[in-house]
C-alpha cells in the first residue's frame, strides 16, 4: 500500500467517512502510522 | 475559514539563503502535514519536501536533500521552507499546501512566495 | 523518479466542447493521482483525488478516470472560467511529481 503522506491523509478520510467520524479525536494524520490501516 | 498566508516576495544574491513562512489558520494545524511546491518560470510544479508539524518529521525530494530545510513553529501554526546557497536557477514562486480532512476535506495552497536570486 | 507526461501541452477548444487532457506515469501509480486548474498569477486549486473523486465544490463538468499509468481529465463541456493551466500529479511515490501542464484556451 501507498505509505506517503497523501496516501495516508486520503486513506484516514475514507477510513472517517465510513464510519461516520466516529473515531478518537486523535486519530489524525500525522499522528496515525499506516500500520494503523 | 482555512487560510495558508505566506511571507512576501525576497530578492536574494547568489550562495544567500532564503526562508520562507506559511502561516496556517482554520485548522488544528499539527493534525495536517504540509508540503512544499515550487514553480520556476515556464516549468512544471516541483514538490520540495512534506514535514508532519506534530513530530517535525521530514521527507524531502533528493534534488533539494541538503539544501532545503522544512521546520515549523507549533506554538504560532507556523510551517517554514529554507533554501540555502541559492543559484539562478532557484527562482521562483514557493507555495506550501496542506491536504486537509477537517473541517473540510480539502487540498488548500497558500498564495505563493515570488524568490527572485540574481546578482 | 515518476515521469509525469501531459498532452496536449496546449489546446484550444469552443465553449459547450468536451475536452479532454491525459496523463501518463511512467511506471504504475495505482489510483494515486491528483489534478489541479491553475489560473495566471494564481495558485493551484485541486480539482480531482485518487484520480477520479472530485473535491466538494468542483463542477459535475470535471471528471477525472483512470489507473496504473494512464490518466484522463475530462471537462464535459468548456465553460469560459476554465481557461486556466491543469497539472497531474502522482503521490504514490517520493518525490511527488507533477505533469509539465496543459494551457487551456478557448477559441
Known amino acids: 500500500a501507498c505509505d506517503t503522506a497523501t496516501c495516508v491523509t486520503h486513506r484516514l478520510a475514507g477510513l472517517l467517512s465510513r464510519s461516520g467520524g466516529v473515531v478518537k479525536n486523535n486519530f489524525v494524520p500525522t499522528n496515525v502510522g499506516s500500520k494503523a490501516f | 475559514e482555512v487560510q495558508l498566508v505566506q511571507s512576501g516576495a525576497e530578492v536574494k544574491k547568489p550562495g544567500a539563503s532564503v526562508k520562507v513562512s506559511c502561516k496556517a489558520s482554520?485548522?488544528?494545524?499539527?493534525?495536517?502535514?504540509m508540503n512544499w511546491v515550487r514553480q520556476a518560470p515556464g516549468q512544471r510544479l516541483e514538490w520540495i519536501g512534506v514535514?508532519?508539524?506534530?513530530?517535525?518529521?521530514?521527507t524531502y525530494n533528493r534534488k533539494f536533500k541538503g539544501r532545503a530545510t522544512l521546520t515549523v513553529d507549533k506554538s504560532a501554526s507556523t510551517a517554514y521552507m529554507e533554501l540555502s546557497s541559492l543559484r539562478s536557477e532557484d527562482t521562483a514562486v514557493y507555495y506550501c499546501?496542506?491536504?486537509?480532512?477537517?473541517?473540510?476535506?480539502?487540498?488548500?495552497w497558500g498564495q505563493g512566495t515570488t524568490v527572485t536570486v540574481s546578482s | 523518479d515518476i515521469q509525469m507526461t501531459q498532452s496536449p501541452s496546449s489546446l484550444s477548444a469552443s465553449v459547450g466542447d468536451r475536452v479532454t487532457i491525459t496523463c501518463k506515469a511512467s511506471?504504475?501509480?495505482?489510483?494515486?493521482v491528483a489534478w489541479y486548474q491553475q489560473k495566471p498569477g494564481k495558485s493551484p486549486k485541486a480539482l480531482i483525488y485518487?484520480?477520479?473523486y472530485r473535491y466538494s465544490g468542483v463542477p459535475s463538468r470535471f471528471s477525472g478516470s483512470g489507473s496504473g499509468t494512464d490518466f484522463t481529465l475530462t471537462i464535459s463541456s468548456l465553460q469560459p472560467e476554465d481557461v486556466a493551466t491543469y497539472h497531474c500529479?502522482?503521490?504514490?511515490?517520493?518525490?511527488?511529481?507533477f505533469g509539465q501542464g496543459t494551457k487551456l484556451e478557448i477559441k
Open positions: 485518487s484520480a477520479s
Open positions: 511506471q504504475n501509480v495505482g489510483t494515486n
Open positions: 514535514i508532519n508539524p506534530y513530530t517535525g518529521r521530514t
Open positions: 499546501a496542506s491536504l486537509l480532512i477537517r473541517p473540510h476535506y480539502f487540498d488548500y
Open positions: 482554520g485548522y488544528t494545524f499539527t493534525d495536517y502535514y
Open positions: 500529479q502522482q503521490y504514490n511515490f517520493y518525490p511527488y511529481t
